[in-house]
């Protein structure tokens, strides 16, 4: 999930130095930017979130807001400061004419300005509710720990908190920030106003149809009776949670955001800040049968984004639309005909569908995992959710062809036991945004702050790419893939793992002069090879004969085409051991795979040789997949021979630590 790659409009207005009457002129050459929702009907012009630079204090925010009002007044414009943000993001919410944007962008401390926009509940139906009792025996599902140590915040509609299914489990906070309902004849029927939130609270923690029966919840009203809210209202809600957390620190917090709007830089930024404050955020991927990266908060990398599947583990269709998909989705969960509390009466149940329901399932699972292991970090929780998911059960044909490889084939499941997974080396695959087709275009995939990048690969549908490399960026390794001339673009694929006390570095060998190919190995004592990457400057990497072979007895070595530079990811961590596993097919094949055995985790995935007919390599769960161009177009058979190279690791240290705990 890449924060910076949404499909949104950015209007960059350069700051001019001759700004009238500014006491504090902005630093020379800085540019504040203006953003607005790409989906026109969802825009709310006239209300703007002015985001200030990170270190800005509350007093400076207030001063900047007053300055804007004064300067607007001199021009004959009325403005109203609706809210001053602090605690999550510095800034303010202002009601003003769009004519003032240029002026506002020149104010000191301004980082960017975003026009407010709508967000929506992600469930159907709103009006076709079927009252039904829970359709299973309650004693079939008795979880070992119901999430009792965890508080789940729900940002949604109002809720009927004394419904029999959730009474005493939900504390309704006094937070409310919702837009007026649309339409002059809208009739506010209480049970409909409460419908979405009541159902979701029941899915998370309901006595009889809930996932985490012991979890306590707090509700914030950010969606109106039509299930509609605003980005600004959601931001103020997230800020409220952060302030509550600071005033009265409790145990682990899960925030459920069962809503979606267009891509929003500011909403994603707020989610990032809250996540970095130790809060687990779970959100709906969206019900638009579209790329989740085009929506917020679904596109925020720090948020756990959930798509919806049905009882047959197929993606949910919702009318003409359906669940969102793509690389910004972390996993799927049940989201069709989900039974939960109905606000129609205090004992009623109803079936609703959508990615909101799917997200509520995952919020419940997260609450149970955190209750069993309260010290879990967000990265550890996400990795566990992925690890315990059902793999490869979704029929990918439902997704658009170009999204299938990017969309995780994972359906959330409760761990068989809430304890005892600590010994596992957890890894996940993170895809970058598409690079775009220009000759020098690159794509970058990043791991979460407390994950280690153990390997880096690349993929291009056209096969025209110039490989990939791991490089340092802001003190952390990232995975960068390079497009080639005439290529339609590339993806970078990072393998991100939880490896405590790891010390990793990248060793590079430039292209070899000799015909034997390029090699690089981990020469530092105690360092093991976790991944191999190769990158080349030539436009078309020809077939390299004889085929590149790894010399026997040298497992800690990456080998590649003589015209490519080879990068070895070498890591030292207590008890870490790795081995190379290869699977070569002499005849041309569109896909070659190699998997790690039980107890070993795939950390690296690459292809040999790196010739131009190889589209790329990527990890799917514990399997390394190498894709080649359609065999009918490749010509010679010798060029078609491809080897998939997997690096499989395990941590004896983690295993021992786990045994000592038991």
């Amino acid at each position: 999930q890449e924060d910076e790659d949404g499909d949104y409009e950015e209007l960059v207005l350069a700051l001019r130095s001759e700004e009238d009457g500014l006491a504090e002129a902005p630093e020379h050459g800085t540019t504040a930017t203006f953003h607005r929702c790409a989906k026109d009907p969802w825009r709310l012009p006239g209300t703007y979130v002015v985001v200030l630079k990170e270190e800005t204090h509350l007093s400076q925010s207030e001063r900047t807001a007053r300055r804007l009002q004064a300067q607007a007044a001199r021009r004959g414009y009325l403005t109203k400061i609706l809210h001053v943000f602090h605690g999550l993001l510095p800034g303010f919410l202002v009601k003003m004419s769009g004519d003032l944007l240029e002026l506002a962008l020149k104010l000191p401390h301004v980082d960017y300005i975003e026009e407010d926009s709508s967000v929506f509940a992600q469930s159907i139906p709103w009006n076709l509710e079927r009252i039904t009792p829970p359709r299973y025996r309650a004693d079939e599902y008795q979880p070992p720990d119901g999430g009792s140590l965890v508080e789940v915040y729900l940002l949604d509609t109002s809720i009927q908190s004394d419904h029999r299914e959730i009474e005493g489990r939900v504390m309704v906070t006094d937070f409310e920030n919702v837009p007026e309902e649309d339409g002059t004849r809208f009739h506010r029927q209480a049970s409909k106003c409460d419908s979405h939130g009541t159902h979701l609270a029941g899915v998370v923690s309901g006595r009889d149809a809930g996932v985490a029966k012991g979890a306590s919840m707090r509700s914030l009203r950010v969606l109106n009776c039509q299930g509609k809210g605003t980005v600004s209202g959601t931001l103020i809600g997230l800020e409220f949670i952060r302030k509550s957390q600071l005033v009265q620190p409790v145990g682990p917090l899960v925030v459920l955001l069962p809503l979606a709007g267009g891509y929003s830089r500011v909403l994603n930024a707020a989610c990032q800040r809250l996540a970095r404050a130790g809060v687990v955020l779970v959100t709906a991927a969206g019900n638009f049968r579209d790329d989740a990266c085009l929506y917020s908060p679904a596109s925020a990398p720090e948020v756990i984004t959930v798509g919806a599947t049905n009882a047959q583990d197929q993606p949910v269709t919702l009318g003409t639309l359906g669940t969102n998909f793509g690389r910004c989705v972390d996993l799927f969960a049940p989201g069709e005909d989900i039974i939960g509390a109905s606000s129609d009466c205090s004992t009623c149940f109803v079936s609703q569908s959508g990615t909101s329901q799917a997200a509520a399932h995952v919020a419940g699972i997260a609450a149970m995992m955190l209750s069993a292991e309260p010290e879990l970090t967000l990265a550890e929780l996400r990795q566990r959710l992925i690890h315990f998911s059902a793999k490869d059960v979704i029929n990918e044909a439902w997704f658009p062809e170009d999204q299938r490889v990017l969309t995780p084939n994972l359906v959330a499941a409760l761990p068989p036991s809430t304890h005892g997974a600590g010994w596992q080396l957890f890894c996940r695959t993170v895809w970058s945004a598409h690079s775009g087709p220009t000759r020098m275009a690159t794509a970058v995939a990043r791991c979460a702050p407390d994950e280690e990048l153990l390997s880096c690969s690349s993929f291009s549908r056209s096969g025209k790419r110039r490989g990939e490399r791991m490089e340092a960026q802001g003190g952390k390794l990232v995975c960068r893939a390079h497009n080639a001339f005439g290529g339609e673009g590339v993806y970078a694929i990072a393998r991100c793992c939880l490896l405590p006390q790891a010390n990793c570095s990248v060793h590079t060998a430039p292209p070899a002069e000799a015909s034997m190919g390029t090699r690089v190995h981990c020469h530092q004592q105690g360092h093991v090879l976790t991944g191999c990457s190769s990158h080349w400057e030539v436009e078309d990497l020809g077939t390299h004969k004889p085929p590149v072979l790894r010399p026997r007895g040298q497992p800690n070595q990456c080998v590649g085409h003589r015209e490519a530079s080879i990068h070895a990811s070498c890591c030292h961590a207590p008890g870490l051991e790795c081995k190379v596993k290869e699977h070569g097919i002499p005849a041309p094949q569109e896909q070659v795979t190699v998997a790690c055995e039980e107890g070993w985790t795939l950390t690296g995935c690459s292809a040999l040789p790196g010739t131009s007919h190889v589209l790329g390599a990527y990890a799917v769960d514990n399997t390394c997949v190498v894709r080649s161009r359609d065999v009918s177009t490749t010509g010679s058979t010798s060029e078609g021979a491809v080897t998939a190279v997997a690096i499989c690791c395990r941590s004896r240290h983690l295993a021992q630590a786990s045994q000592e705990l038991q």
């Epitope: 009927q160 009466c345 004992t347």
Partner: antibody, heavy 115, light 109 residues
Framework: QVQLVQSGAEVKKPGASVKVSCKAS????????ISWVRQAPGQGLEWMGW????????NYAQKVQGRVTMTTDTSTSTVYMELRSLRSDDTAVYYC????????WGQGTTVTVSS | QSALTQPASVSGSPGQSITISCTGT?????????VSWYQQHPGKPPKLMIY???NRPSGVSNRFSGSKSGNTASLTISGLQAEDEADYFC?????????FGGGTKLTVL
Amino acid sequence: QVQLVQSGAEVKKPGASVKVSCKASGYPLTSYGISWVRQAPGQGLEWMGWISAYNGNTNYAQKVQGRVTMTTDTSTSTVYMELRSLRSDDTAVYYCARGYGMDVWGQGTTVTVSS
Amino acid sequence: QSALTQPASVSGSPGQSITISCTGTSSDVGGYNSVSWYQQHPGKPPKLMIYEVSNRPSGVSNRFSGSKSGNTASLTISGLQAEDEADYFCSSYTSTSMVFGGGTKLTVL
């Protein structure tokens, strides 16, 4: 602390009505409704119904449906249970209890129906 | 006629364990996680001892435990004490209401 305080004992004639009050304190009122339960002398407990403190919605037991009305006054955090057309077999101790879970109970109100 | 069936009485000596059963149907006890147990001393309101089948409210002795199998719920009191002598009632959700058992008189010999 969480408390439910009920009104005092009542003696009524058959055919009359009785209105028992229950004042709640010490918890967020809208998070729970109030259940009413009665107990005839030497008998077991009988659930009469429930009222939402959040929106005033009610759920009455079939046996008393049509004779019972439950109401709330949110300004005073008080819930009322009125039973009409009293019969001698309505003689009982009437309890209010918090929510469907009935984790906190009032002290009880004795209603005697006698001619 | 109560919807849930309890034994009219049980007895035990101090220090012993006793179990009270509460039998319903798949429409009440068997269909919901919300079986509760109440203790009532003469002239007093009932007191919640167990909720949601097996959970103890804070302040209730861990000598009291609850379980459920199919359509029957059970309350077990271990290490019987004189003050445990009382009436015990079970309750359960039904699809639209609540239902109680007829009550069990526990005598500590």
